[in-house]
Structures are given as structure tokens and as C-alpha cells.
Interface confidence: low
Amino acid sequence: FVRTKIDTTENLLNTEVHSSPAQRWSMQVPPEVSAEAGDAAVLPCTFTHPHRHYDGPLTAIWRAGEPYAGPQVFRCAAARGSELCQTALSLHGRFRLLGNPRRNDLSLRVERLALADDRRYFCRVEFAGDVHDRYESRHGVRLHVTAAPRIVNISVLPSPAHAFRALCTAEGEPPPALAWSGPALGNSLAAVRSPREGHGHLVTAELPALTHDGRYTCTAANSLGRSEASVYLFRFHGASGAST
């Protein structure tokens, strides 16, 4: 069991790398990478290590959420002397190694980004030959996924005393601003609850009392775009319906 140091590198500028007489373990990752939902992103990660001529078996790992304990999203293994890192795990098939671990590069490409990919990622390398050693970035790289607004739910619900209320939930990053418009409303921000805990990209706006029949429109907007959806209230016809 070889005791190795923990990387506390916050960014590329404060990385200590001692080039002589021997390298120590260090990992270089940027603090943050930004990309838009639906696009691809590259998570850079390079490292130095003290085992100058190591060409034994190695494993490259990326995990999400937290170092050491977070779930693995990517893992590949290279046999002794090989520069081919054979993928053993790629969550949903969307993660692919861009770098060459033999050349101290663990950079990862993430395809078809979704808002759920917005989290911190940690790279790790393990040597498992005559040298047995491993190292993992402690702070990792934050993948910041941006997205134009999308209304995920719009509905009319009964309230006490035969009244109705409308709810609109949208997602986006930055979290979108929501506004309701409709009969006798003008343009109203209504009661906006945002963002929901554990659902950082979701914003909900409520119209607590619908006083008139007709079409109620929810508009979600952020710096990347806007989205609209409507519900129709037919109170006197015994039905309420939604049309998006």
C-alpha cells in the first residue's frame, strides 16, 4: 500500500509541479467547463506521477458527484505497454476518453449533454503492475450545463371553495423567469417558487385563483431563449383542459 497525496488543485494556476529530480503526483483540472444541453463537452484532466517509466497495467476512472465515493461514469483499462485504453464502463454510452493515459492525459468527452449532467466530475488513475499506486483529483471539474427554458408541466388544479389554480413548472439554466398571462391578469409573475431543492434547474409559478374562463399562458425565459405553454379553463362547462 503506497500512501499518495491528495490533489487540492483548484485551478491550473496554483498547481505545484516539481519537475526535478522527480515528479510527484498532481492532477490538473480546470475549475469549470461550460456547455449547452444537447452539445458535447470536454472535461480536461492531466496528471504527473513519480513513476518515471511506468508502462504496466493502468485504469482510468471518472466519477461524478464526489471524490472517492461518487458513482463511476467512465472506466477504461490499458494492458501493460498498450496505449489503447479499453472502455469497461461508459454511462449511457455518452462518455469517451479523448486523452491518452500513457501520456498523462485523462481528458473525457461527454456527448448529448442534459441538465442532469450538471455536476462535479473527478478523474482518477490507478497503476496496478510492479508499481501499485493511484491518485484522484480532490476538487474535480464542475460541468456547467446551460439550457434554454422548457416547460415540463402546466396544469389546472381544483382549489378549496370550487376555485381553480394553475401551476407551471419549467426547467432551464440559468433558471428561467416565469410569467403568467391570461384573462384579467395582464402579465403576472404570480407566486414563483424557485428553484426547488434537489431540482436546481426547475422553477414553478402558481396562479392561486383563476377568476375567469379562458386561456392562461405561462412564459419561461432566460438568456438562452423562451418557451410558452397554455391551459384553458372552462369552468362552467364542467371541465378544464390543457393545451401545449
Partner: antibody, heavy 118, light 112 residues
């Protein structure tokens, strides 16, 4: 060699505050998290919280949120824990421990015995 | 919080024989990455705790191979194959799967 040093004892009055120190040597102080652990007389171990010396980020056991404040002085490679509004319940041995590779506690200080008494 | 449970005392053991100490967690410490986040520490009388085992089954640096550990996700056993006088103390299991990190109440190893 790695060493984590703590003063042996502190005697303070109820209601007062105390700042316990933990001096690290023999390794790069900013490369490992520092944890604090409480042990009441004849009892088990309780994790108080941790601090990352590179950026002073902290994480506390909720139970100690209002009791303990963790800080570091990078220039002297020293971690500190301030305990406030002391009562007899705070009388205990307080250990600092370095967080190793997987964030287990690989090097422990000798502990500071805190006695809260009037 | 994850609760770690241990018996306060072990069955008294004779020097040179083997001893077992058990620990149970309220939640599985086996992560999907294959690592079990269970640790064993020994606190000898009048001393600070010291790390014995990390991630359920790995011997810490400098710890004699008389010590070994095994278990499932929630039930764990520390074994000492040939107990020596210097092994006396309180053995704590601990988890760092989740914050806050938690310890068992400790098991005191008793010598006959």
C-alpha cells in the same frame, strides 16, 4: 515524518469560548483535509467536521454547526477549532486527524483535553 | 445519519489465540463503485486512535498482517489471528460513505 501536534489540556469557564490548535508538519499542509473528532470521558468517537486547508472550505456534523468553527492558518500549517458557549457537556478530548487518501483518518494528534469548569 | 453498532466488549481471549470483533451499519456501505467505505481504528489505553483497516479489507501502512477484515455491505468482522498483549484497547468501526462520518461505540478487547 508526518506529525500532528496538539496542546495537552485547556481549562475554561462555562459560557466562555476556547480555540484549540493543531499544528501539522512533515507533509504539504494544503494537500490533505483536516478533521476534528470529539471523545467524551469513557465514551466513543464523534466526528465534528472537516476543513480543506487549501481553500478553508468546511463541512460540519449538523450537531456541531453552532458549537464549532474550523479555520486554518496556512502560513503556520495550523488548523484551529473554536468552541463557543461552553458547558460541561463540552468537556472532552478533542482530536484533530489528517484525512488520508480516501479521507480516512491516517494521522491523529495526541488530543487536547478540554475541561469546562467554574 | 448512518448508525454503526458494536458490542461494548469482546469475548475474553487468550494470548496467542484468535479474536473477532463485529460491527453493523444501518445502511449498506458498499458503493456502486465496488468500494466498501468501512474502516477500523484501534485506540490503545491512553493513546490516540490509529488506523488499522481502510475500505473494509485493506491493511493500513505498518499494521501487522495478523489483522484482517471482511464483511458484506452491512455486517463486518475484524479478525486478529494471534492476539498479542499490545493489541489490547478499544476497536472502533467507522464509515465515510456519507457525511457526517460516524463511528461505532467501540469494542473493548479483553484478555483472559
Amino acid at each position: 515524518q508526518v506529525q500532528v501536534q496538539q496542546p495537552g489540556a485547556e481549562l475554561v469557564k462555562p459560557g466562555a469560548s476556547v480555540k484549540l490548535s493543531c499544528k501539522a508538519s512533515g507533509y504539504t499542509f494544503t494537500s490533505y483535509w483536516m478533521h476534528w473528532v470529539k471523545q467524551r470521558p469513557g465514551q466513543g468517537l464523534e466526528w465534528i467536521g472537516l476543513i480543506n486547508p487549501s481553500n478553508a472550505r468546511t463541512n460540519y456534523n449538523e450537531k456541531f454547526n453552532t458549537k464549532a468553527t474550523l479555520t486554518v492558518d496556512k502560513s503556520s500549517s495550523t488548523a484551529y477549532m473554536q468552541l463557543s458557549s461552553l458547558t460541561s457537556e463540552d468537556s472532552a478530548v478533542y482530536y484533530c486527524a489528517r484525512g488520508g487518501d480516501g479521507d480516512y483518518f491516517d494521522y491523529w494528534g495526541q488530543g487536547t483535553t478540554l475541561t469546562v469548569s467554574s | 445519519d448512518i448508525v454503526m453498532t458494536q458490542a461494548a466488549f469482546s469475548n475474553p481471549v487468550t494470548l496467542g489465540t484468535s479474536a473477532s470483533i463485529s460491527c453493523r451499519s444501518s445502511k449498506s456501505l458498499l458503493h456502486s463503485n465496488g468500494i466498501t467505505y468501512l474502516y477500523w481504528y484501534l485506540q490503545k489505553p491512553g493513546q490516540s486512535p490509529q488506523l488499522l483497516i481502510y475500505q473494509m479489507s485493506n491493511l493500513a501502512s505498518g499494521v501487522p498482517d495478523r489483522f484482517s477484515s471482511s464483511g458484506s455491505g452491512t455486517d463486518f468482522t475484524l479478525r486478529i489471528s494471534r492476539v498479542e498483549a499490545e493489541d489490547v484497547g478499544v476497536y472502533y468501526c467507522a464509515q465515510n460513505l456519507e457525511l457526517p462520518y460516524t463511528f461505532g461505540g467501540g469494542t473493548k478487547l479483553e484478555i483472559k
